[in-house]
């Protein structure tokens, strides 16, 4: 359905408030260094222009594409070359190359100051003084730090952010009311950003087919009562939504996501029995709720998969006629029967099945060749099961902090070239799998753990892609999306690594560590641990544990001392000397 003016169409569909919010997100995700005021000015100009097009769709420039309009607007920024360097060259290009150029310059790790949370009273005053600006600032700050954040979902976060301030700034104890809510939004926001980043990486690095396969598996687990044709329709629509958002087409994305939520709710009888509550909610809550809805119950008496996919005489005929559809049916049937498997495992099984058919259907006796294909699945299923069992046992034995440390050591030895902040961030997140997933019963552990690990390892991949330093990381990240985790698991100690020169400065600590939060103190200690392993990759667990225990005791002692700084200086020297001796440095 072609519209005379795309900008007028989206303005009318979304309404002024959502239109302005989404344009702000889009601009902040592209120009991540621009000041807030500059973005607000650009958004207001675009909004005023959109209103003229709503009034008269034939008005000048109203027929231009959104990319043309937005790109032209971004290219009016005066300091583009000084602030962004070669990104300014994008403005010399024509659409669609210009937009592609902007996308390529999105920075997953922008050089921006950490967001420091002001005092509660200061925040409440700012909220009451100018609610609109306060909420816009939230959108801007999140969007520029998370350039792939799922825009319609960010609107939902902003709505919750506003509700938290509306409620808590009137409360007797503002801080007790507000701070837990803000912590929850921060943690959920980081998780949401990372999940969306994987979807965009999947689409951009491995293509639409890879994303669709992921979506078939996940939606089939979630909606096992839905027919294959219904799941296929949802997958097609969902792929369009995420392709748009990942491509910076945020207005279209939000509009299409709303349409998809509407369709799902209108057809919930043929999709899932779990959607009722979601579908009673307002739009943003509804879409979020559908995306998080629990798996429906599996239909009773599902027949054996072997009948259609191994025993049938038509396997090769059906496969040859419509390969992706037949593989999609296989994935759908397998996934709806296995909510206990991770999506990536299901995709590995489908890939194995595909490889077998490719080989066997060209053989003299196809059936004889593929008859035992399901036997090939056994080791693929057992590998993540065993890994999760072992790691959950280790987590239960050590607790989260020490489990993270075990992973820090493990991953630093695998890929010691990776920067210390990245190793700390990624290993800490890998370690969170324990508290997130090990509490679940067996049937929920694998989908929780392995699909979460896929999200975390993607963070490593996108951060590493910006400044590649390890061929092993590049290999695991680029060869196969579904085999990333097994690829990293299989890495042993990098024997080619030349240990880092010892630098006492790296292990010099000051009294400021005493005022840090527990989390920040852990990060300091974990940073030291990574550096230690980089200096002495062959250090044993026992050696590292002894040094870390000494370090913890040293911090505790000096933080209790009257003259903390002197303690850190003197005891620090002793600690460094003792550690060098213990590790044979």
């Amino acid at each position: 359905d072609a519209h005379k003016s795309e900008v007028a169409h989206r303005f009318k569909d979304l309404g002024e408030e959502n239109f302005k919010a989404l344009v702000l997100i889009a601009f902040a995700q592209y120009l991540q260094q621009c000041p807030f005021e500059d973005h607000v000015k650009l958004v207001n100009e675009v909004t005023e222009f959109a209103k003229t097009c709503v009034a008269d769709e034939s008005a000048e420039n109203c027929d231009k594409s959104l990319h043309t309009l937005f790109g032209d607007k971004l290219c009016t920024v005066a300091t583009l070359r000084e602030t962004y360097g070669e990104m300014a060259d994008c403005c010399a290009k024509q659409e669609p190359e210009r937009n592609e150029c902007f996308l390529q310059h999105k920075d997953d790790n922008p050089n921006l100051p950490r967001l420091v949370r002001p005092e509660v009273d200061v925040m409440c005053t700012a909220f009451h003084d100018n609610e609109e600006t306060f909420l816009k600032k939230y959108l801007y700050e999140i969007a520029r730090r998370h350039p792939y954040f799922y825009a319609p979902e960010l609107l939902f976060f902003a709505k919750r952010y506003k509700a938290a301030f509306t409620e808590c700034c009137q409360a007797a104890d503002k801080a007790a009311c507000l701070l837990p809510k803000l912590d929850e939004l921060r943690d959920e926001g980081k998780a949401s950003s990372a999940k969306q980043r994987l979807k965009c990486a999947s689409l951009q690095k491995f293509g639409e087919r890879a994303f669709k396969a992921w979506a078939v598996a996940r939606l089939s687990q979630r909606f096992p009562k839905a027919e294959f044709a219904e799941v296929s329709k949802l997958v097609t629509d969902l792929t369009k939504v995420h392709t748009e958002c990942c491509h910076g087409d945020l207005l279209e994305c939000a509009d299409d996501r709303a349409d998809l939520a509407k369709y799902i709710c209108e057809n919930q009888d043929s999709i899932s029995s779990k959607l009722k509550e979601c579908c009673e909610k307002p739009l943003l809550e509804k879409s979020h709720c559908i995306a998080e809805v629990e798996n429906d119950e599996m239909p009773a008496d599902l027949p054996s998969l072997a009948a259609d996919f191994v025993e049938s005489k038509d396997v090769c005929k059906n496969y040859a006629e419509a390969k992706d559809v037949f593989l999609g049916m296989f994935l759908y049937e397998y996934a709806r029967r296995h909510p206990d498997y991770s999506v990536v495992l299901l995709l590995r099984l489908a890939k194995t099945y595909e490889t077998t058919l490719e080989k066997c259907c060209a053989a003299a006796d196809p059936h004889e060749c593929y008859a035992k294909v399901f036997d090939e699945f056994k080791p693929l299923v057992e590998e993540p099961q065993n890994l999760i069992k072992q790691n959950c046992e280790l987590f239960e034995q050590l607790g989260e902090y020490k489990f993270q440390n075990a992973l820090l050591v493990r991953y630093t030895k695998k890929v010691p070239q990776v920067s210390t902040p990245t190793l700390v961030e990624v290993s800490r997140n890998l370690g969170k799998v324990g508290s997130k997933c090990c509490k679940h019963p067996e049937a929920k552990r694998m989908p929780c753990a392995e699909d979460y690990l896929s999200v975390v390892l993607n963070q490593l991949c996108v951060l590493h892609e910006k400044t590649p330093v390890s061929d092993r990381v590049t290999k695991c990240c680029t060869e196969s999306l579904v085999n990333r985790r097994p690829c990293f698991s299989a890495l042993e100690v990098d024997e080619t690594y030349v240990p880092k020169e010892f630098n006492a400065e790296t292990f010099t600590f000051h009294a400021d560590i005493c005022t840090l939060s527990e989390k920040e103190r852990q990060i300091k200690k974990q940073t030291a641990l990574v550096e230690l392993v980089k200096h002495k990759p062959k250090a044993t667990k026992e050696q590292l544990k002894a040094v870390m225990d000494d370090f913890a005791a040293f911090v505790e002692k000096c933080c209790k001392a009257d003259d903390k700084e002197t303690c850190f200086a003197e005891e620090g020297k002793k600690l460094v000397a003792a550690s060098q001796a213990a590790l044979g440095l």
């Epitope: 044709a229 038509d314 059906n318 040859a320 419509a322 390969k323 037949f326 259907c361 060209a362």
Partner: nanobody, 123 residues
Framework: QVQLLESGGGEVQPGGSLRLSCAAS????????MVWVRQAPGKGLEWVST????????VYAESVKGRFTISRDNAKNTVYLQMNSLRAEDTAVYYC????????????????RGQGTLVTVEP
């Protein structure tokens, strides 16, 4: 839109040969499996043969195995059916077909099909 144009049919004596061609357009031929089906007078559609997108996989109905050969030329967007040792029971209208999104695999009534080409085998 999808277009399939069959040619090469005609009258032939039992034991004779014919080569059918099907020129395709309006879709990505090189990523699509192709099928030959036939309809004998007063009968329903009968599947004859299938070839995969890359031509690595070919499958035949028992009734034509060893006599018919399916092939394709992705550069020319054309699929072929070489028919040897023809029999009276091979008399039918032969259709070239390809999968239509949303249809059931093997439900040939729902596939994209051409107009067909008539093959008559009689002494």
């Amino acid at each position: 839109q999808v277009q399939l144009l069959e040619s090469g049919g005609g009258e032939v004596q039992p034991g004779g040969s014919l080569r059918l061609s099907c020129a395709a357009s309006g879709f990505t031929f090189s990523t699509s499996g192709m099928v030959w089906v036939r309809q004998a007078p007063g009968k329903g559609l009968e599947w004859v043969s299938t070839i995969s997108d890359d031509a690595r996989i070919t499958v035949y109905a028992e009734s034509v195995k060893g006599r018919f050969t399916i092939s394709r030329d992705n550069a020319k967007n054309t699929v072929y059916l070489q028919m040897n040792s023809l029999r009276a029971e091979d008399t039918a209208v032969y259709y070239c077909a390809t999968y239509r999104a949303g249809s059931r695999i093997g439900s040939y009534e729902d596939y994209y099909r051409g107009q067909g080409t008539l093959v008559t085998v009689e002494p």
